[in-house]
Interface confidence: low
């Protein structure tokens, strides 16, 4: 890879739709990694400091950002549900964390071309009640 | 997975931190549905997945867009996919 | 901008009637779904029954086959006509449109619905 063109990802949690908490009685959240070169990155939910796999779907497969482009940018979004009564209490934090890897294992950087640190992204959001 | 009760349901979730970033989740539709990409290159909808709530027995599909432009709304972010009509629930305004 | 304005509320008895109105006006052309939302003192805002432009209505359970959902897109009006009312109906009632672009939601300032002997 182009060192010039590596990029970390930009990463943003969005919260669950009163509707569909009112709908389902169920809580989603979306974590969003964007505008990442390469496609090297592993994400993770993590609830009240520790890591979780049940209620977790993540795409199994970065897109394009601008699929015409051999270099394009790359995005990945992933999703957590959990009951909402889980996603209204206050107290529960919920933080996405994605890993990126600045350059493949096949890579090789000089001396003067520092080799990109892994770098951890996170965004994150708190329960919220009614009001 | 078969989808025991399917209840397809567009919702518009907002960024923790900017209210004004939104994505529109596609969830709860059954295995049948097969969900399209944009024709709009500035629209980003991701593959369907499955997502099993291991301590409520419970599975559902679900499908990501999201998009920069001003004129993307969640209520035909779908709209390519052959999903039924009035999925999109909006959310009332916080009366917080 | 689309400005929604409610009326019709107020004071009945439980069994009896009365029609909402939302009169709207601004950039109608925008809205896919009308709907009309309710909250009652400490509870959340919640859904009480919606109608698209292509004519399709949903309905809270708790509403269903009681309360009606329509427009006369002449009088650029919804309405909200309400029979056979509870105590538990009593709440604000608020109009809300959704729109395909940005904002995406608008909402009038509500009306008062209370129903008691």
């Known amino acids: 890879e182009d060192l010039n063109k590596v990029f970390p990802p930009e990463v943003a949690v969005f919260e669950p739709s009163e509707a569909e908490i009112s709908h389902t009685q169920k809580a989603t959240l979306v974590c969003l990694a964007t505008g990442f070169f390469p496609d090297h990155v592993e994400l993770s939910w993590w609830v009240n400091g520790k890591e979780v796999h049940s209620g977790v779907s993540t795409d199994p497969q970065p897109l394009k950002e601008q699929p015409a482009l051999n270099d394009s940018r790359y995005c990945l979004s992933s999703r957590l549900r959990v009951s909402a009564t889980f996603w209204q209490n206050p107290r529960n934090h919920f933080r996405c964390q994605v890993q990126f890897y600045g350059l493949s294992e096949n890579d090789e950087w000089t001396q003067d071309r520092a080799k990109p640190v892994t770098q951890i992204v996170s965004a994150e959001a708190w329960g919220r009640a009614d009001c | 997975p078969n989808i025991q009760n399917p209840d397809p349901a567009v919702y518009q979730l907002r960024d923790s931190k900017s209210s004004d970033k939104s994505v529109c989740l596609f969830t709860d539709f059954d295995s049948q549905t097969n969900v399209s990409q944009s024709k709009d290159s500035d629209v980003y909808i991701t593959d369907k997945t499955v997502l099993d709530m291991r301590s409520m027995d419970f599975k559902s599909n679900s499908a990501v867009a999201w998009s920069n432009k001003s004129d993307f709304a969640c209520a035909n972010a779908f709209n390519n996919s052959i999903i039924p009509e009035d999925t999109f629930f909006p959310s009332p305004e916080s009366s917080c | 901008e689309v400005q929604l304005v409610e009326s019709g509320g107020g004071l009945v008895q439980p069994g009896g009637s009365l029609r909402l109105s939302c009169i709207t006006s601004?950039?109608?052309?925008?809205?896919?779904?009308w709907g009309w939302y309710r909250q009652a003192p400490g509870k959340q805002r919640e859904l009480v029954a919606s109608l698209t432009i292509g004519g399709a209505t949903n309905y809270a359970d708790s509403v269903k086959g009681r309360f009606t959902i329509s427009e006369d897109s002449a009088k650029n009006t919804v309405y909200l006509q309400m029979n056979s009312l509870k105590p538990e109906d009593t709440a604000v009632y608020f109009c809300?449109?959704?729109?395909?672009?940005?904002?995406?939601?608008?909402w009038g300032r509500g009306t008062q619905v209370t129903v008691s002997s």
């Open positions: 601004g950039e109608t052309f925008k809205i896919n779904i």
């Open positions: 809300n449109a959704k729109s395909r672009i940005y904002p995406y939601d608008y």
